[in-house]
């Protein structure tokens, strides 16, 4: 990330509100709980790759394997969901690629009306066969860890049988779970052997234990609930954009910067320039000029279009994006070739009409 002296002030946000434009999402990798997931870091020339999840350094463990440019998650759980990034550190710079991981299945949460199979969970016994409680559908109990977004509905199920018919009660963190323990209380569907909590909040996090008992015995099963909250993020830029470009003198070129931001982003296009014949200020930092920024007078700020370029336009162009949370920036180089020379392709380029002919 460059430091610099500014020829023109780059403020945190524009004085006028940015116009609305499409905000692009990072790539999303979806896995079901228990599956393994492998993601390749889509960055080139990486001397060292480091990984983060939700901004926190990610190291290898018994389920996370980091081999070269690959991240492997074994036996994925909903807690593995989040915003991941791989950063390629090079001798002169570093680049980051972001992607989302979503580990989910339909049983994680949902309302109490989806129990079409509830009746078969309620097993009636022959009155002569006295029997201690037992689980009738362990498949529905395999997923012990439930990571659920705040405000969702959560359902825990303990389908059981026994004779006489067992009763079911619920504990939270080992203590009796009372209605007054949470705003809005909770529902128990005895017919479905389920506990339902609507609109979960972080204070609902914890261990929930169903205790199923009759006079012949008692069994229990514990679920762990984690309520996942989103916090606003600094902007994220799509890897590889803007892309290096080349064109001939007099040609046109476009640089594109794809932004993902859940707070209104402010985009600036900045170029290294000379001031009084020098590229660097007294502090040793390069001089930069803001060419374009998002605002009322700026159309599509994600695109910087240069027309009728001259050799003086060659150089590094920086897409700098900020919101009130933080910043991100990535850069690309423009090569301007003499008129008689045909430009060579570098990455994905948007070339001038001259070149296309």
């Amino acid at each position: 990330r460059p430091s610099f002296s500014l020829v023109e002030d780059t403020t945190l946000e524009p004085e006028e509100p940015p116009t609305k434009y499409q905000i692009s999402q990072p790539e999303v990798y979806v896995a079901a709980p228990g599956e393994s997931l492998e993601v390749r870091c889509l960055l080139k020339d990486a001397a060292v790759i480091s990984w983060t999840k939700d901004g926190v350094h990610l190291g290898p463990n018994n389920r996370t394997v980091l081999i070269g440019e690959y991240l492997q998650i074994k036996g994925a759980t909903p807690r593995d969901s989040g915003l991941y990034a791989c950063t390629a550190s090079r001798t002169v710079d570093s680049e980051t690629w972001y992607f989302m991981v979503n580990v989910t299945d339909a049983i994680s949460s949902g309302d109490d009306e989806d129990d079409t199979d509830g009746a078969e969970d309620f097993v009636s016994e022959n009155s002569n066969n006295k029997r201690a409680p037992y689980w009738t559908n362990t498949e529905k109990m395999e997923k012990r860890l439930h990571a659920v977004p705040a405000a969702n509905t959560v359902k825990f199920r303990c389908p059981a049988g026994g004779n006489p018919m067992p009763t079911m009660r619920w504990l939270k963190n080992g203590k009796e779970f009372k209605q007054e323990h949470r705003i809005g209380g909770y529902k128990v569907r005895n017919q479905h052997w389920s506990l339902i909590m609507e609109s979960v909040v972080p204070s609902d996090k914890g261990n929930y234990t169903c205790v199923v008992e009759n006079e012949y015995g008692s069994i229990n099963h514990t679920y762990h609930l984690d309520v996942v909250e989103r916090s606003p993020h600094r902007p994220i830029l799509q890897a590889g954009l803007p892309a290096n470009a080349s064109t001939v003198v007099g040609g046109d070129v476009e640089f594109v910067c794809k932004v993902y931001s859940d707070a209104q982003p402010h985009i600036q296009w900045i170029k290294h320039v000379e001031k009084n014949g020098s590229k660097y200020g007294p502090d040793g930092l390069p001089y930069l000029k803001v060419l374009k920024h998002s605002g009322i007078n700026s159309s599509n700020a994600e695109v910087l279009a240069l027309f009728n370029v001259t050799e003086a336009d060659a150089g590094e162009y920086i897409c700098k994006v900020s919101n009130y949370i933080g910043q991100a920036n990535q850069s690309a180089w423009l090569t301007v070739l003499p008129k008689q020379q045909a430009p060579g392709r570098e990455k994905e380029i948007t070339a001038s009409p001259d070149y296309l002919e």
Epitope: R1, F4, E15, P18, A263, Q264, I325, G326, Q327
Partner: antibody
């Protein structure tokens, strides 16, 4: 967990300067703006400015631009807000906040002759 | 600068009541609005970001709505611990202006 710990209360004379510190921990310091917010007695909240520790970028409310200076020391994960040429109306509680999500406990600055 | 106008400036309600506080911006802020709760002697606490998103650890009785220039903070069932001053804030463009505040008391 994320924590912002501010320096203690200050009593200053008019015309003097004050430098309030805000030490951050529990997150990647360079990746978030630190904002400064003023609350004068009986008044509402007023945004003063922000600094991005990664590159030192600053943005100021014009009302404070002349007298307030924000700096960041990445080696100690600390941000400083210096207010010069103090006057009585600068008497207030000053808060630092990480992207307005996490807030320091506030520093009371009293300007009195 | 974007001006933020909050109303009412103060209100008194009973425990269990539904309470609404409104905030108007002098121009379109595209949903870039935060709500804060400030209790006496305490730091402000983020309740809602991006006009509608509940912040970490905030009870679900708090909700935010609105778009363009008009925004609302709703407390679905007022609790004694909700006594505080509530502020809205423009986070679209600098300066990040706050509303004048709404002081909420229990009857």
């Amino acid at each position: 967990q994320v924590q912002l710990v501010q320096s203690g209360a200050e009593v200053k004379k008019p015309g003097a300067s004050v430098k309030v510190s805000c030490k951050a921990s529990g997150y990647i310091f360079r990746n978030y703006y630190i904002h400064w917010v003023k609350q004068a007695p009986g008044q509402g909240l007023e945004w003063m400015g922000a600094i991005y520790p990664d590159n030192g970028d600053t943005s100021y409310n014009q009302r404070f631009k002349v007298r307030a200076t924000l700096t960041a020391d990445t080696s100690t994960s600390t941000v400083y807000m210096e207010l010069s040429s103090l006057r009585s109306e600068d008497t207030a509680v000053y808060y630092c906040a990480r992207a307005f999500t996490y807030w320091g406990q506030g520093t009371t600055v009293t300007v009195s002759s | 600068d974007i001006q933020m106008t909050q109303s009412p400036s103060s209100l008194s309600a009973s425990v269990g009541d539904r309470v609404t506080i409104t905030c108007g911006a002098s121009e379109n802020i595209y949903g870039a609005l935060n709500w804060y709760q400030r209790k006496p002697g305490k730091s402000p606490k983020l309740l809602i970001y991006g006009a509608t998103n509940l912040a970490d650890g905030v009870p679900s009785r708090f909700s935010g709505s609105g778009s363009g220039t008009d925004y609302t903070l709703t407390i679905s069932s007022l609790q004694p611990e909700d006594v505080a001053t509530y502020y809205c804030q423009n986070v679209l463009s600098t300066p990040y202006t706050f509303g004048g505040g709404t002081k909420l008391e229990i009857k």
